[in-house]
Amino acid sequence: AGVFELQIHSFGPGPGGAPRSPYSARGPCRLFFRVCLKPGLSEEAAESPCALGAALSARGPVYTEQPEAPAPDLPLPNGLLQVPFRDAWPGTFSLIIETWREELGDQIGGPAWSLLARVTRRRRLAAGGPWAGDIQRAGAWELRFSYRARCELPAVGTACTRLCRPRSASRCGPGLRPCAPLEDECEAPPVCRAGCSLEHGFCEQPGECRCLEGWTGPLCMVPVSTSSCLGLRGPSSTTTGCLVPGPGPCDGNPCANGGSCSETPGSFECTCPRGFYGLRCEVSGVTCADGPCFNGGLCVGGADPDSAYICHCPPGFQGSNCEKRVDRCSLQPCRNGGLCLDLGHALRCRCRAGFAGPRCEHDLNDCAGRACANGGTCVEGGGAHRCSCALGFGGRDCRERADPCAARPCAHGGRCYAHFSGLVCACAPGYMGARCEFPVHPDGVSALPAAPPGLRPGDPQRYP
């Protein structure tokens, strides 16, 4: 696990570009950015959703362009855009940065958004490295930014896949301890003997296979009956409550030629070393002429039986012979009970009612963990939640100052004035009412409900 961080340094007209400002809009506006991360550099990445994650920046300061004034340094949102990633950092990725302008003028239906620029870059980047700088052009615009990927302890390494522990810590098998706050020396786990059980074995030296309590055998596949009931297979004993060992499909390692065995429901699967394949890795002496690569894999090398061949697998397949389909859903990327769909070219999450987001990470119903700012209250209902904002505030979280006059509430040319407790309409001659909705007859009498005593047409009307 870790975090991808993006820092926008500047956005403005590029060299030779139109000398216009990104703020050239009617009325006040502000900039913000959105980032999308996709794994891989292939063309297939273009078809996949933002599988590594996405983030939306804060809005920048409100800016009103001064006519005839040169474009100033552009006020940008503060802070980093951070995209947390849960699994390994892929090393190669596609980065999409959208630059948006939010126009705060008198649009009907609220502020509009305008997409100013969209840059897409394919990059290689190791986690834990320094900031990488970039300058990208999109039409007449130029975007300057830096980015990095960093692991979050206890994960370390260029892909955030190694677990970190102090060198002084005792060796504790596969469940490595996280680093102490000031001790971040890390060791790559040694490569164990081929076939050593990932679940029940571990190693301190390369090539060895040491077993956890309750397991024995050269590859730690055989359960020990005298153990204290750790991870044993078989029916429960009535006398001890412990599991009585039963035979497992990998017992005795049915995989030949150094293949490693892993259990599947009711069966087993052999992962074969290069140069061997078959159910039990029993087939050898294969060359590229024998067509050993399945599912459209490209065979390289292996011109004679003594030299190994390598299968370069197409996206979606893996294994020494490209025989295994990558089950990207096995990583359970969809949160909150979402249904994972591996479409081949892309991964999709179909979210349960009340959840949304590329990975169903947004809980639309949850008021419990939801804070509405500025005195707003969270309201659930209709399969969604929303903030009911206090007067003078708006937006999804009531963080935005709302202009009560933005919706043009005063009818028939009435003028709207913002007031600390709402709004006031100053009606045009001939109209009255809280929103100037009632025409006044020439005799001074309203055609609809009578005005309260002492209120003359044209007087400002307080709107509660």
Partner: nanobody
């Protein structure tokens, strides 16, 4: 499952207008961002604009601002693209797309983020 059908395309002279419709069948369209992309021959599919899922706000690409407007009629499960002051470089196949994501902010400008697509309608601007 949501099915999208575009209509309203055709041949128009420069400076003319067209109104495209995107009719959605299936689930309630109001829960979805409904947006328009366009694709000219030999070009990548380009975001034009549309309305967001969570509050219906309009989003535009800068090049069409002031000429194109986006609206939706949730009662009819239909989105609209009103195109005025058309130019020859607006010639393309226009596609309607919909998705529940993102749950906040403007709609995605990236085609791969949309689960549901129409088959497109041709717009040709030529004298």
């Amino acid at each position: 499952e949501v099915d999208l059908v575009e209509s309203g395309g055709g041949l128009v002279q420069p400076g003319g207008s067209l109104r495209l419709s995107c009719a959605a069948s299936g689930r309630t369209a109001s829960r979805y961002s409904m947006v328009w992309f366009r694709q000219a021959p030999g070009q990548e599919r380009e975001f034009v604009g549309g309305n967001s899922a969570h509050d219906g706000r309009s989003a535009y690409t800068d090049s069409v601002k002031g000429r194109f407007t986006f609206s939706r009629d949730n009662a009819k499960n239909t989105g609209y693209l009103q195109m005025n002051s058309l130019r020859p470089d607006d010639t393309a196949v226009y596609y309607c797309a919909a998705d529940t994501n993102p749950p906040y902010g403007p709609p995605w400008s990236t085609p791969s983020e949309y689960e549901y697509w129409g088959h497109g309608t041709q717009v040709t601007v030529s004298s």
